[in-house]
């Protein structure tokens, strides 16, 4: 029962995590304009992996996609790649784990096969989570570097009458979504790996004891059914657990004002 619960919970946590990774990858708020030294701006800039946006105080929001591939910074390309790899691995992991769930019966699939699949999906979730965390961390590091570079530039060459305030960017909501989502996927993957151990019971070798009765030769083998870990062994006695795992995936929608027609 504990194994099923661990597996089910691992699946749910990973599912939420991967949904979060997808959401973070699609979000536009990877970096947002730093308002610390400029709280009076009437124009707010924010950027994602795929496009940059400008929101005016009038509510008009304009987003422009990065239509160039070669002109983009290598770090941004790397972050994109890490996030996509994370999503792909996570999606495959989810697909594998669905079939591996102990509470789902598919034909006459053995526990050993399910254990294998659980381990595979768990590893995939762990790698997926690590990809997301790495991607978000690389982007965050890029932001920190650029932030201090632009801060240094802000306080040089200000001798003239005209002030040119450089736009600085800080961490956007997507980074925090990505970190949390990556962490959840990682935790889910670990839980799946733990569940795998419980799904594959150890081989127990029972020695057959022969009782010789007068007139009849009866061989008696103690033990209800043989527990096996051998791949390809046919375990007939299976306990089916009705796992009622539910996912409540709350998607937060940001209320953007309006676009002019």
């Amino acid at each position: 029962m504990a194994v099923t619960a661990c597996q089910g919970l691992g699946f749910v946590v990973s599912l939420i995590g991967i949904a979060g990774i997808i959401a973070a990858t699609c979000m536009d708020q990877w970096s947002t304009q730093d308002l610390y030294n400029n709280p009076v701006t009437a124009v707010f800039n924010y950027q994602g992996l795929w496009r940059s946006c400008v929101r005016e105080s009038s509510g008009f929001t304009e987003c422009r996609g990065y239509f160039t591939l070669l002109g983009l910074p290598a770090m941004l390309q790397a972050v994109r790649a890490l996030m996509i790899v994370g999503i792909v691995l996570g999606a495959i992991g989810l697909l594998v784990s669905i079939f591996a769930l102990k509470c789902i019966r598919i034909g006459s699939m053995e526990d050993s096969a399910k254990a294998n699949m659980t381990l595979t999906s768990g590893i995939m979730f762990i790698v997926s989570g690590l990809c997301a965390i790495a991607g978000v961390s690389v982007f965050a590091n890029m932001l920190v570097t650029n932030f201090w570079m632009s801060t240094a530039n802000m306080y040089t060459g200000m001798g003239g009458m005209v002030q040119t305030v450089q736009t600085r960017y800080t961490f956007g909501a997507a980074l925090f979504v990505g970190w949390v989502a990556g962490g959840l996927t990682l935790i889910g993957g670990v839980m799946m790996c733990i569940a795998c151990r419980g799904l594959a019971p150890e081989e127990t070798n029972y020695k057959a004891v022969s009782y010789h009765a007068s007139g009849h030769s009866v061989a008696y083998k103690p033990g209800g059914f043989k527990a096996s870990t051998g791949f390809g062994s046919n375990t007939k006695n299976k306990k089916i657990y009705d796992g009622g795992a539910r996912t409540e995936d709350e998607v937060q929608s940001y209320p953007s004002k309006h676009d002019y027609v």
């Epitope: 701006t41 124009v43 400008v54 005016e56 008009f60 305030v165 004002k257």
Partner: antibody, heavy 118, light 113 residues
Framework: QVQLVQSGAEVKKPGASVKVSCKAS????????IHWIKQAPGQRLEWMGY????????NYNQKFKARVTITADTSASTAYMELSSLRSEDTAVYFC???????????WGQGTLVTVSS | DIVMTQSPDSLAVSLGERATMSCKSS????????????LTWYQQKPGQPPKLLIY???TRESGVPDRFSGSGSGTDFTLTISSLQAEDVAVYYC?????????FGQGTKLEIK
């Protein structure tokens, strides 16, 4: 079409308060900011502040913040600008305006003349 | 606050001639995020509210005659009327739409010579 209709001219004594209204029509009132702009005789236009009727959020020019209050009644599609502790330099035409692309003002009320005189 | 300075204070141009007026801001109005300048031009005739002519420094509002054009970037902007018409006599204002508080120039009064 978008229309902003303001209340009529007001004559007030120094120290009193005035409340100017701006009734909007022809668009979704809760979707756009309503700004208030002052134009004193022979002076440049001065932005006083705005309200976003969708949530009642306001933003004021620090110069007027202590004395101006901008409100909105969404059921009546009307914005209000109240100016307190009136003085002679508050004699001006007050415009309400709806914002547009580039944080510009595309639609204006006809203006309300407020005269502060003892 | 961003200070907007217009020049000249008044301008007299013959009908059919080109009219040019300038607007300078104390800070750059160029937004790096979309490479747009948050400067607006208005026309105001006596007894009327201002009328929007140009936003984003160079985008003409619909219904505004194409003889009106805006140019410039950063801190220096220009409004040009290619061929002055009698109905163009008015006061022209520029406005900062980049930072709060929004500020206006003192205006340029355009007259017919």
């Amino acid at each position: 079409q978008v229309q902003l209709v303001q209340s009529g001219a007001e004559v007030k004594k120094p120290g009193a308060s005035v409340k100017v209204s701006c009734k909007a029509s022809g668009y979704t009132f809760t979707s756009h900011n309503i700004h208030w702009i002052k134009q004193a005789p022979g002076q440049r236009l001065e932005w006083m502040g705005y309200i976003y009727p969708g949530n009642g959020g306001t933003n004021y020019n620090q110069k007027f913040k202590a004395r101006v209050t901008i409100t909105a009644d969404t059921s009546a599609s009307t914005a209000y600008m109240e100016l307190s502790s009136l003085r002679s330099e508050d004699t001006a035409v007050y415009f309400c305006a709806r914002d547009y692309y580039g944080n510009s003002f595309a639609y204006w009320g006809q203006g309300t003349l407020v005269t502060v005189s003892s | 606050d961003i200070v907007m300075t217009q020049s000249p204070d008044s301008l007299a141009v013959s009908l059919g001639e080109r009219a040019t007026m300038s607007c300078k801001s104390s800070q750059s109005l160029l937004n790096s995020g979309n490479q747009k300048n948050y400067l607006t031009w208005y026309q105001q005739k006596p007894g009327q509210p201002p009328k929007l002519l140009i936003y984003w420094a160079s985008t003409r509002e619909s219904g505004v005659p194409d003889r009106f054009s805006g140019s410039g970037s950063g801190t220096d902007f220009t409004l040009t009327i290619s061929s002055l018409q009698a109905e163009d006599v008015a006061v022209y204002y520029c406005q900062n739409g980049y930072r709060f508080p929004f500020t206006f120039g003192q205006g340029t009064k355009l007259e017919i010579k």
